[in-house]
């Protein structure tokens, strides 16, 4: 959580002289309360935007927009404090809009925007716009908060950002997993254009359970340049455990830009469908399609093998 580095932070607009300042997140109007304070923002809109830094990196930023209520309290509005809280780490970043001239009513509703909070993929933020001065103790609150979940690196707009590309977001392994006979899985995926090793992590689970019944790790050495973008095929042997039938295959790359913290891709093979209460099949019921014009029943042995084959 940081501010976009190189931009001159501007909040002036026609009819208002305004400057953006860094804030400690504790505006001094809390310490010296005023008698008359403005009302809260009318609406806050938040969406994700992508901006470039002065080093040419593409970073995800929050675009925050809010409007003022059309009441007389705008005469007492001296500015606004924008606060962004990252939920999981309690990190908070604030800026202050300082109005250098008085607001006046005009034909359009006053609208403000700010697009300089740099955020992380797959993180949740609480955005608060606090009108200044803040209210006296027990006064009506004059802030509004909205939460915003930044998409992860799978999201199309996020994929091209520098933090996501650094963690390998552009690599699409297109994993296929095929169940073979004799308790084996065939895993196939597309290698990336870097000479780095991969790990395949196989975790098997019983049907409808989350406790693993088998785990296996398979190391794939770094490919040669002529193998880049080619398919890699690996056959994994499963543990012969009845009911250990749901398999999650995860591929972990070790790209130089993210080392052991690269984005993983996974695929899952579900347990074969089993009827809840299979009805017993009477001996005389043919389990094959008779050839046209023929009603011959095969002998018992044949019926048995057809039956067996049918269930496979």
């Amino acid at each position: 959580l940081r501010l976009l580095d190189h931009r001159a932070l501007v909040c002036s607009q026609p009819g208002l002289n305004c400057t953006v300042k860094n804030s400690t997140c504790l505006d001094d109007s809390w310490i010296h309360p005023r008698n008359l304070t403005p009302s809260s923002p009318k609406n806050i809109y938040i969406n994700l935007s992508v901006s470039s830094t002065q080093h040419g990196e593409l970073v995800p930023v929050l675009h925050v927009e809010w409007t003022l209520q059309t009441d007389a309290s705008i005469l007492y509005l001296e500015g606004a404090e924008l606060s962004v809280l990252q939920l999981n780490t309690n990190e908070r970043l604030c800026v202050r809009f300082e109005f250098l001239s008085k607001l006046r009513h005009h034909h359009r509703r006053w609208r403000f925007t700010f697009s300089h909070f740099v955020v992380d993929p797959d993180q949740e933020y609480e955005v608060t716009v606090h009108h200044l001065p803040k209210p006296i103790p027990d006064g009506d609150p004059n802030h509004q908060s909205k939460n915003f979940l930044v998409p992860d690196c799978e999201h199309a707009r996020m994929k091209v950002t520098t933090p996501c590309m650094s963690s390998g977001s552009l690599w699409d392994p297109n994993i296929t997993v095929e169940t073979l006979e004799a308790h084996q899985l065939r895993v196939s995926f597309t290698l990336w254009n870097e000479s780095t090793h991969y790990q395949i992590l196989l975790t098997s689970f019983p049907h409808m359970e989350n406790h693993s019944c088998f785990e296996h790790m398979h190391h794939i050495p770094a490919p040669r340049p002529e193998e880049f973008h080619q398919r890699s095929n690996v056959t994994l042997t499963l543990r012969n455990l009845k009911g250990c039938c749901r398999h999650q295959v995860q591929i972990q790359p070790f790209f130089s830009s993210c080392l052991n913290d690269c984005l993983r891709h996974s695929a899952t093979v579900s347990c074969p469908e089993m009827p809840d209460t299979p009805e017993p099949i009477p001996d005389y019921m043919p389990l094959w399609e008779p050839r046209s014009g023929s009603s011959d029943y095969k002998d018992d042995d044949d019926k048995g093998s057809s039956h067996h084959h049918h269930h496979h």
Epitope: E126, T128, R264
Partner: antibody, heavy 118, light 107 residues
Framework: EVQLVESGGGSVQPGGSLRLSCAAS????????MNWVRQAPGKGLEWVSI????????HYADSVKGRFTISRDNAKNSLYLQMNSLRDEDTAVYYC???????????WGQGTTVTVSS | DIQMTQSPSSLSASVGDRVTITCRAS??????LAWYQQKPGKFPELLIY???TLQSGVPSRFSGSGSGTDFTLTISSLQPEDVATYYC?????????FGPGTKVDIK
């Protein structure tokens, strides 16, 4: 001194309700997200719920979703956990905990004990 | 949801021994991992956050490492006061799950 003090624990029958409180002091309560974490007798820690500083983000563990409600009153520096439809497996010591800037939870209360038993 | 596992579930070591506890996330969590120490009858205390940053006031014999899915808590020289249960916790996204814990005692 930074302090969290839980209260409101006690014994209740299955299906009953309790409301836990956590009184915060020594820091700017309104600037922090707050958590409830519990620990069943002889078991490990289980994260229960989190509420952001201005209550706009709330999350629950699957095990309590739909039964527990987290809330806060910043003016009173207080955090609450309303627990309804209590079950035997909700028996635990309940802690409120403040997340540290940078991650983890660096301030914990002493805990309050909830016993659900018929 | 991401699962957290810890190993071993318990261990006994001598005073002065180097002790290592591992924590594994079922999916990558970057360095959003914390370690706690809980002594019997007490509330948990934060030892390490951001996978490797030592919380202030925690003795330097404790250290953390790892990123992505595999993390380690190391006590370089076990002391009698380190007898406790140690928990890892992920905090990249809710639910902020804890590991099942590792109980450490003295031989």
């Amino acid at each position: 001194e930074v302090q969290l003090v839980e209260s409101g624990g006690g014994s209740v029958q299955p299906g009953g309700s309790l409301r836990l409180s956590c009184a915060a002091s020594g820091f700017t309560f309104s600037s922090y997200s707050m958590n409830w974490v519990r620990q069943a007798p002889g078991k490990g820690l289980e994260w229960v719920s989190i509420i952001s500083s201005r209550s706009s983000i709330i999350h629950y563990a699957d095990s309590v979703k739909g039964r527990f409600t987290i809330s806060r009153d910043n003016a009173k520096n207080s955090l609450y956990l309303q627990m309804n439809s209590l079950r035997d497996e909700d028996t635990a010591v309940y802690y409120c905990a403040r997340p540290k800037v940078g991650g983890g939870m660096d301030v914990w209360g002493q805990g309050t004990t909830v016993t659900v038993s018929s | 949801d991401i699962q957290m596992t810890q190993s071993p579930s318990s261990l006994s070591a001598s005073v002065g021994d180097r002790v290592t506890i591992t924590c594994r996330a079922s999916q990558g969590i970057s360095n959003y991992l914390a370690w706690y120490q809980q002594k019997p009858g007490k509330f948990p205390e934060l030892l390490i956050y951001a996978a490797s940053t030592l919380q202030s006031g925690v003795p330097s014999r404790f250290s953390g490492s790892g990123s992505g899915t595999d993390f380690t808590l190391t006590i370089s020289s076990l002391q009698p006061e380190d007898v406790a249960t140690y928990y890892c916790q992920k905090y990249n996204r809710a639910p902020f799950t804890f590991g099942p814990g590792t109980k450490v005692d003295i031989k």
